[in-house]
């Protein structure tokens, strides 16, 4: 940056190089150039010469004043007009930043996405600070009293292997930058209560032609959690409102759910699950489309990158999806 140049004098900022956005600031430039009594001192912001609010303080020093400074970052430098010098002589430069102190982090949430091997902790950081803000996540075992700290600039993934202090923990987040520091409330967690099951995925749909046509949705998860509650939502693509069906699910086999739908309409389906009685949901699965036939039975299938999900049954149309065992996204 601009701060790496060789200086013939110095430049400083009051109240500080990093300051609260909207403040009035003064930038001072003091020349120390051999054999030069500066005729004039100039200020540049991001390479553009400033014309106003410059005050000469003495023979070697000048001040540039800004009212209500709102730029997150700026590169400042100053120059001198020396007698007998054709060009301006560079005095010094400095990068300045404006922003806000951090808000109190809230909505601290920790979940373990099944198969990830990590506990993922997130929080609402509040308003944008514009300046470098670091977060320290504190994880304290309620059984051993041992505390671990993790430094991050956003969320944190903590290996479950490093959580050796039993099952119960307190988690809180400290936010800090050059303008201030705040601390969240403490969140109490039990590792067994924060697991989000492996992604539930809709793999296939078929409509069976009967007196009342019936659509069967095939869906599955490779979770090892035995008691899982799921929701499947569906709607005609032309509708705004979702219909929701609830299931107590046992993923020891691929699930088949029956729907009685209107003929010749394109529907969209999504599914999500949670460990029964627990707080956190999976994100909704990717959209799965199925058009009901007028009369002829129809099968819709997803061909997954993981062959596990190929059923070997005849399909009328193929759409591609991707199965991961590591669910990420909204946790509801």
């Amino acid at each position: 940056g601009i701060t790496n140049i060789n200086c013939s004098g110095h430049i400083w900022v009051e109240p500080a190089t990093i300051f609260k956005m909207g403040m009035n600031i003064s930038i001072y430039c003091q020349a120390a150039i051999k054999n030069c009594q500066p005729r004039k001192l100039h200020f540049y912001k991001n390479g553009i010469k400033e014309r106003f609010q410059i005050t000469r303080i003495n023979k070697t020093t000048a001040r540039l004043w800004y009212k209500n400074f709102l730029e997150p970052h700026a590169s400042m430098y100053c120059t001198a007009e020396c007698p007998k010098h054709f060009q301006e002589t560079l005095i010094c430069g400095k990068d300045i930043s404006s922003g806000y102190p951090p808000d109190i982090p809230d909505e601290v949430t920790c979940v373990i996405y099944e198969y990830s091997g990590n506990m993922t902790c997130t929080w609402n950081a509040g308003k944008l600070t514009y300046i470098d803000t670091k977060y320290v996540v504190h994880v304290k075992s309620l059984e051993t009293e041992e505390e671990q700290q993790y430094l991050t600039s956003s969320y944190i993934n903590i290996s479950t292997d490093s959580l050796q202090g039993g099952k119960k923990y307190l988690v809180w987040v400290q936010a800090a930058n050059a303008l201030g520091m705040e601390e969240s409330k403490q969140l109490q967690i039990h590792l067994d209560d924060i697991v989000i099951p492996s992604a539930a995925v809709i793999s296939r749909a078929e409509t069976i032609n009967a007196t009342v046509p019936k659509t069967i949705i095939y869906w599955d998860s490779q979770t090892t959690i035995e008691k899982v509650s799921c929701e499947m939502r569906y709607k005609a693509t032309t509708n705004q409102t979702w219909n929701v069906k609830e299931f107590d699910t046992n993923f020891t086999y691929v699930q088949q759910s029956e729907f009685y739908l209107e003929p010749n309409i394109k529907y969209v389906f999504q599914v999500r699950c949670q460990e029964t009685g627990k707080r956190y949901w999976q994100p909704w699965s990717s959209l799965f489309f199925h058009k009901t036939p007028e009369t002829v039975p129809q099968v819709t299938s997803k061909a997954f990158q993981h062959d596990t999900w190929n059923s070997g049954l005849t399909v009328a149309s193929i759409s591609t999806g991707h199965l991961t065992s590591d669910n990420r996204g909204d946790i509801g």
Epitope: Y115, T160, Q222, T224, F251, T252, Y253, V254
Partner: antibody
């Protein structure tokens, strides 16, 4: 690539305890899945014995529960079978496996053959 | 406990033929049945789970069907390398149980 490898004695005397080790490479046993022991008797009959979940919880076959223990050493990425008071009826090839969710056994070790004899 | 019965100990077939093996559960297991192939000196290898879902990398000549208590495993066109013992297993509930196996012999 996930690999499982069983190890243990070839021969155990009746009434003694049997200890077998399954060493897993390519996946951490604490990151997920159920990790099982299955045995195959000389006549080829397969018997499920029990499993340990990634969280450390266990589930045993009712017929073996009184003398079976499955444990693990997470630092070595190993899980273990201990079968007490063995008899000649426990002569078998012992496999460790990883289950596909709550469904079938997707990864198997090569098996270790155990003979119970005095 | 659920008992899985494979009524045929042996099945004889020719290369290129279609062959079907059956398995019966002593009680309802929905579609929670897997099929394995075992060759001499090797561990069982997963082919089908949840009655009809082929496992990763399994050739599509292997198919499965059935639900409830009756299940069928079919090899659409038998190859010489398919000579093996085939086991069914219920993964509906613990204790998990296996069938006694059907040995596929090539004529």
């Amino acid at each position: 690539d996930v690999q499982l490898q069983e190890s243990g004695p070839d021969l155990v005397k009746p009434s003694q305890s049997l200890s077998l080790t399954c060493t897993v490479t390519g996946y951490s046993i604490t990151s997920g899945y159920n990790w099982h022991w299955i045995r195959q008797f000389p006549g080829n009959k397969l018997e499920w014995m029990g499993y340990i979940h990634s969280s450390g919880t266990t589930n045993y076959s009712p017929s073996l529960r009184s003398r079976l223990s499955i444990t693990r050493d997470t630092s070595k990425n190993q899980f273990f079978l201990q079968l007490n008071s063995v008899t000649t009826e426990d002569t078998a090839t012992y496999y460790c496996t990883r289950q596909l969710g709550l469904k079938a056994m997707e990864y198997w070790g090569q098996g270790t053959t155990l003979t119970v004899s005095s | 406990d659920i008992v899985m019965t494979q009524s045929h100990k042996f099945m004889s077939t020719s290369v290129g033929d279609r062959v079907s093996l059956t398995c019966k559960a002593s009680q309802e297991v929905r579609t929670a049945v897997a099929w394995y192939q075992q060759k001499p000196g090797q561990p069982p290898k997963l082919l089908i789970y949840s009655a009809s879902y082929r496992y990763t990398g399994v050739p599509d000549r292997f198919t499965g069907s059935g639900s409830g208590t009756d299940f069928t495993f079919t090899i659409i066109s038998v190859q010489a390398e398919d000579l093996a013992v085939y086991y069914c297993q219920q993964h509906y509930t613990t204790p998990y149980s296996f069938g006694s196996g059907t040995k596929l012999e090539i004529k």
